[in-house]
Interface confidence: low
């Protein structure tokens, strides 16, 4: 017969899980021993594994609720293609029966005693109720039993007394205006309302109770704008480190306007948020060296030659300079301390000369003394020999410029009886007086 085939068998509940499908034979379904089958939907689920006993079911309820009874439980041989221990076929149930007792004895009814006296009326004025009671002890019930009917009964009673009128509050009056126009100030704004003990008033005879509670109440006003809070300075912060490693610097302290922060249109803190101090490292700053001006050129000479004056023989000369003022690990002067150049020596050489044009007029001398004059000159200028302007001293080092050096002896035709300099002098006109400009202002 075809069966419903499932992929899982749940041991704890004995249920089939994971329906694979129907219309297959048990033999085909149980090709996989992990599978399970049902002969019809909702029927007994049998696993495909070899048969074995299921877990025992829980005990059924005791057959009686009081005194001794008995109860059953069962297990089933579940599986396919074989038998359970005891040569039992799959599907067979095995039962167990045991004695049980939910409650040792069965309940027994009790009987009522006679009614007790009536209690006083429930009120001291006007009409109320009164109550009387009886006990379930004639006889007492056994094993959780009870008496039938009620343990107490009530009836109406009349005190023949007029009741006093107790006071009750009339409705609250309107809220008064707020005691302040903003909240957060020194006094919290409040509004107040009052009520009267007049709905009704307490009676005089017999005396009624006054109204409970207070005749007025207060509450915080809502919807008010916050009061402005003026800002206050916090403490000065730490002094910043001196920003320089030598000489004087400036350190700073800062404070914040947050003690409190200005709020709701309150003014900002008055005064400065920062203050500065001079800090003294007491360490002098480095002073960089500076070159002095170049010294005089040394005489133009050539090694191993006594003199090269007045000859077309290039020589060399040098000049030096001093690096001054370097202190406290300042930078040394950049560049060369010595300057070397190539030269032709025309020191004391007799050279043909020619007269220059007139120079421009010089300054008036003396500037503040009597009768100042100015002068101009014509000079006997030497005509330099046409030696090569560049030379190649060492092969492969290229051409080097050659400079004429020395004071030659120029020879010119006499001019106005002079051989070297002709000077013309003129008086300076309309000379102003020399006055201290500072004194002039006074």
């Amino acid at each position: 017969d075809p069966v419903l085939c499932f992929t899982q068998y749940e041991e704890s509940s004995g249920k089939c899980k994971g329906l694979l499908g129907g219309g297959v034979s048990v033999e085909d379904c149980c090709l996989n021993t992990a599978f399970a089958y049902q002969k019809r939907s909702g029927g007994l689920c049998q696993p495909c594994r070899s048969p074995r006993w299921s877990l025992w079911s829980t005990w059924a309820p005791c057959s009686v609720t009081c005194s001794e009874g008995s109860q059953l439980r069962y297990r089933r041989c579940v599986g396919w293609n074989g038998q359970c221990s005891g040569k039992v076929a799959p599907g067979t149930l095995e039962w167990q029966l045991q004695a049980c007792e939910d409650q040792q004895c069965c309940p027994e009814m009790g009987g009522w005693s006679g009614w007790g006296p009536w209690e006083p009326c429930s009120v001291t004025c006007s009409k109320g109720t009164r109550t009387r009671r009886r006990a379930c002890n004639h006889p007492a019930p056994k094993c959780g039993g009870h008496c039938p009917g009620q343990a107490q009964e009530s009836e109406a009673c009349d005190t023949q007394q007029v009741c006093p009128t107790h006071g009750a509050w009339a409705t609250w009056g309107p809220w008064t205006p707020c005691s302040a126009s903003c909240h957060g100030g020194p006094h919290e704004p409040k509004e107040t309302r009052s009520r009267k003990c007049s709905a009704p008033e307490p009676s005089q005879k017999p005396p009624g109770k006054p109204c409970p509670g207070l005749a007025y109440e207060q509450r915080r006003c809502t919807g008010l704008p916050p009061c402005p809070v003026a800002g206050g300075w916090g403490p000065w912060g730490p002094v910043s480190p001196c920003p320089v490693t030598c000489g004087l610097g400036q350190t700073m302290e800062q404070r914040t306007c947050n003690h409190p922060v200005p709020q709701h249109g309150g003014p900002f803190c008055a005064g400065d948020a920062t203050r500065t101090h001079i800090c003294n490292t007491a360490v002098p700053c480095p002073v960089d060296g500076e070159w002095d001006s170049w010294g005089e050129w040394s005489p133009c000479i050539r090694r191993n030659m006594k003199s090269i004056s007045c000859q077309e023989i290039p020589g060399q000369q040098s000049r030096g300079r001093t690096c001054r003022g370097r202190k406290f690990d300042g930078h040394r002067c950049a560049g060369q301390q010595q300057d070397i150049r190539h030269c032709y020596s025309i020191q004391h050489c007799p050279l043909k000369g020619s007269w220059s044009e007139w120079s421009t007029w010089g300054l008036c001398m003396p500037p503040c003394g009597p009768n100042p004059t100015r002068a101009r000159q014509r000079l006997c200028t030497p005509l330099l020999p046409k030696y090569p302007p560049t030379v190649s001293m060492v092969e492969g080092q290229g051409e080097k410029n050659v400079t004429f050096w020395g004071r030659p002896l120029p020879r010119c035709e006499e001019l106005q009886g002079q051989k070297l300099v002709v000077e013309e002098k003129r008086p300076c006109l309309h000379v102003p007086a020399c006055k201290d400009p500072e004194e002039e202002e006074l």
Epitope: G247, P284, C285, K327, F328
Partner: nanobody, 129 residues
Framework: QVHLVESGGGLVQAGGSLRLSCAAS????????MGWFRQPPGKEREFVAA????????YYADSVKGRFTISRDNAKNTVYLQMNSLKPEDTAVYYC??????????????????????WGQGTQVTVSG
Amino acid sequence: QVHLVESGGGLVQAGGSLRLSCAASGRTFSSYAMGWFRQPPGKEREFVAAITWSGSSIYYADSVKGRFTISRDNAKNTVYLQMNSLKPEDTAVYYCAAEETSKYSGSYYYMMGDSYDYWGQGTQVTVSG
């Protein structure tokens, strides 16, 4: 350029006095700050006293305060160190130094040998116990 020559050193008993002089060549003596330094045997050179170009500021090492006095005479191009109440620990070679007046000032500056541009050869002072 300034050339400095110290004089006045010698041997003296503890508690005695000496006056050291330092003569400077050059016309611009009055524009230099002057200092006295000393080098005890086997120790490093240390500051003794200094005087600014005008004489308006004078600085002393703590060890000589109240006993030594520095002064200058710009007309004679000379700086002096008057040493009283001498102690054996004052034994040293005493050097005179000149500093071209700079933009720096303050005791720390004048107490540093590096601050000075020109130095004398030194004069020996020995104080016996």
